[in-house]
């Protein structure tokens, strides 16, 4: 099912243009900004979503770094180069010929350079830590119930297999969701943890990417879980290469 047939829309990506011009008059949807055909039965790649977002730019965001190897998206929004499969190209450059290497979630993992900069491979982000703070509640959430609801959310809303949700930690009011997915573990058809994390990030900001589906309504035993802030840390299979100047 490439898209909803009735009114020809893309349930998993509202940043698309859809028309019944696929094989046999089937609904086909293309991502804004790139024109790449997307599979509307699953999440659209973060690269294509960022590219689409640049046609309606919003404020960039800034996160903090918890340790020497964890990366955060300090650079905010940029118009990325995506490969034909919708993945980030290893090397990204801006209009002024400034270039840098990114990981599989599009976060810069080297110092910026010029057009001579080489990025030999797209390094996989295999571990994502989503750090949330929830709004005050009368009492703490039951950890087991919270864990179950978050695992179900990632499975049912983002189609991420439960085996990739490594852990859910909770110390009121902080919730940490650990996603792990090595290259060897990711089978064809599996949602990428980077894409799931991006959809989740947009959801908790009230910027849902889903078409015609309600916004995120997360409840634990009927009690709403409202997120105050989100920090996302990315760990790559190969540590990033920054100069010492950046680390001080």
């Amino acid at each position: 099912h490439t898209a909803a047939q009735d009114n020809c829309t893309c349930p998993t990506n509202k940043m698309t243009v859809c028309s019944p011009d696929g094989p046999g008059g089937r609904c086909q949807c293309r991502a804004l900004g790139s024109g790449v055909a997307v599979d509307c039965s699953t999440l659209t790649s973060k690269c294509l979503l960022l590219k689409a977002r640049m046609s309606a730019p919003k404020n960039a965001r800034t996160l903090v770094r918890p340790n020497e190897h964890a990366l955060v998206d300090n650079d905010g929004l940029y118009d990325p180069d995506c490969d034909p499969e919708g993945r980030f190209k290893a090397r990204q450059c801006n209009q002024t010929s400034v270039c840098w290497c990114v990981n599989s979630v599009g976060v810069r993992r080297t110092d910026k350079g010029d057009l001579s900069l080489r990025c030999d491979e797209l390094v996989r982000t295999h571990h994502i830590l989503i750090d949330l703070r929830h709004r005050p509640t009368a009492s703490a959430f039951n950890h087991s119930d919270l864990d179950a609801e978050l695992r179900r959310l990632f499975r049912e809303r983002y189609r991420l297999h439960p085996k990739f949700v490594a852990a859910v930690h909770y110390e009121q009011p902080t919730i940490q969701i650990e996603l792990r997915q090595n290259t060897s573990q990711k089978a064809a058809g599996d949602v990428d943890i980077g894409d799931a994390a991006y959809y989740f990030e947009r959801d908790v900001k009230g910027e849902s990417l889903f078409q015609g589906r309600g916004g995120l309504d997360l409840r634990v035993r009927g009690e709403p879980l409202q997120v105050e802030r989100t920090l996302i840390y990315y760990l790559d299979e190969i540590p990033p290469k920054f100069s010492m100047k950046r680390l001080t």
Epitope: H1, P11, S41, D147, A148, E149, R151, R152, R155, E156, R159, L160, H161, P162, K163, V165, G189, V191, R213
Partner: antibody, heavy 118, light 109 residues
Framework: QSLEESGGDLVQPGASLTLTCKAS????????ILWVRQAPGKGLEWIGC???????TYYANWAKGRFAISKTSSTTVTLQMTSLTAADTATYFC?????????????WGPGTLVTVSS | YDMTQTPASVSEPVGGTVTIKCQAS??????LAWYQQKPGQPPKLLIY???DLESGVPSRFKGSGSGTEYTLTISDLECADAATYYC????????????FGGGTEVVVK
């Protein structure tokens, strides 16, 4: 690849009973196990589910509190039932999802019969 | 999420066509399965994702629908098709009373 239920029995009203689902030929970590029951001559009734990876459990609204699903080893899942009544008389099936993120049940055990009667 | 299945029973001659309908109380985004069950046996998955045939299932079985309305059509009925058929929403395990429809008994004359 197979699933097999065991533990079905004739029990008195008010009793408790634990059923076991044994998996063989596949890695349970890649799947969820669901329990479904069927009263004699009636339809299928979904009881609950466990994500084997992580161990999270989910129940039908009517089953919450009286039924508990848990993983007891790398190849077994149990269904604990308490305060049994005649209405719980049924064949109990365990089933496996297809390894995707949906809940399509492509492998079932043969079922085990639970009879609640005085 | 509740599933309403109709009719409860249907009888058709060999070579005929049977249509079974299933309605979900909310949109289940095509995440619907159809099962066939014969007496004394566990259910067997026939169709998943509303219209995809499970391996080994004859193409006489056809699933369709979207949103909240789904249909199973069995054409060129054979005696072996006599069974009870169930739909199941495969979208969520949260806040449900039963993931299955009530079942449809198909009698082949």
């Amino acid at each position: 690849q197979s699933l097999e239920e065991s533990g079905g029995d004739l029990v008195q009203p008010g009793a408790s009973l634990t059923l076991t689902c044994k998996a063989s030929g596949f890695d349970l970590n890649n799947y969820s196990i669901l329990w479904v029951r069927q009263a004699p001559g009636k339809g299928l009734e979904w009881i609950g589910c466990i994500y084997f990876s992580g161990g999270s459990t989910y129940y039908a609204n009517w089953a919450k509190g009286r039924f508990a699903i848990s993983k007891t080893s790398s190849t077994t899942v149990t269904l604990q039932m308490t305060s049994l009544t005649a209405a719980d008389t049924a064949t109990y099936f365990c089933a496996r999802d297809d390894g995707t993120t949906s809940y399509y049940l492509n492998l079932w055990g043969p079922g085990t019969l639970v009879t609640v009667s005085s | 999420y509740d599933m309403t299945q109709t009719p409860a029973s249907v009888s058709e001659p060999v070579g005929g066509t049977v249509t079974i309908k299933c309605q979900a109380s909310e949109d289940i985004y095509n995440l619907l399965a159809w099962y066939q069950q014969k007496p004394g046996q566990p259910p067997k998955l026939l169709i998943y994702a509303a219209s995809d045939l499970e391996s080994g299932v004859p193409s006489r079985f056809k699933g369709s629908g979207s949103g909240t309305e789904y249909t199973l059509t069995i054409s060129d009925l054979e005696c072996a098709d006599a069974a009870t058929y169930y739909c199941q929403q495969a979208y969520t395990v949260g806040n449900i009373d039963n993931a299955f429809g009530g079942g449809t008994e198909v009698v082949v004359k």
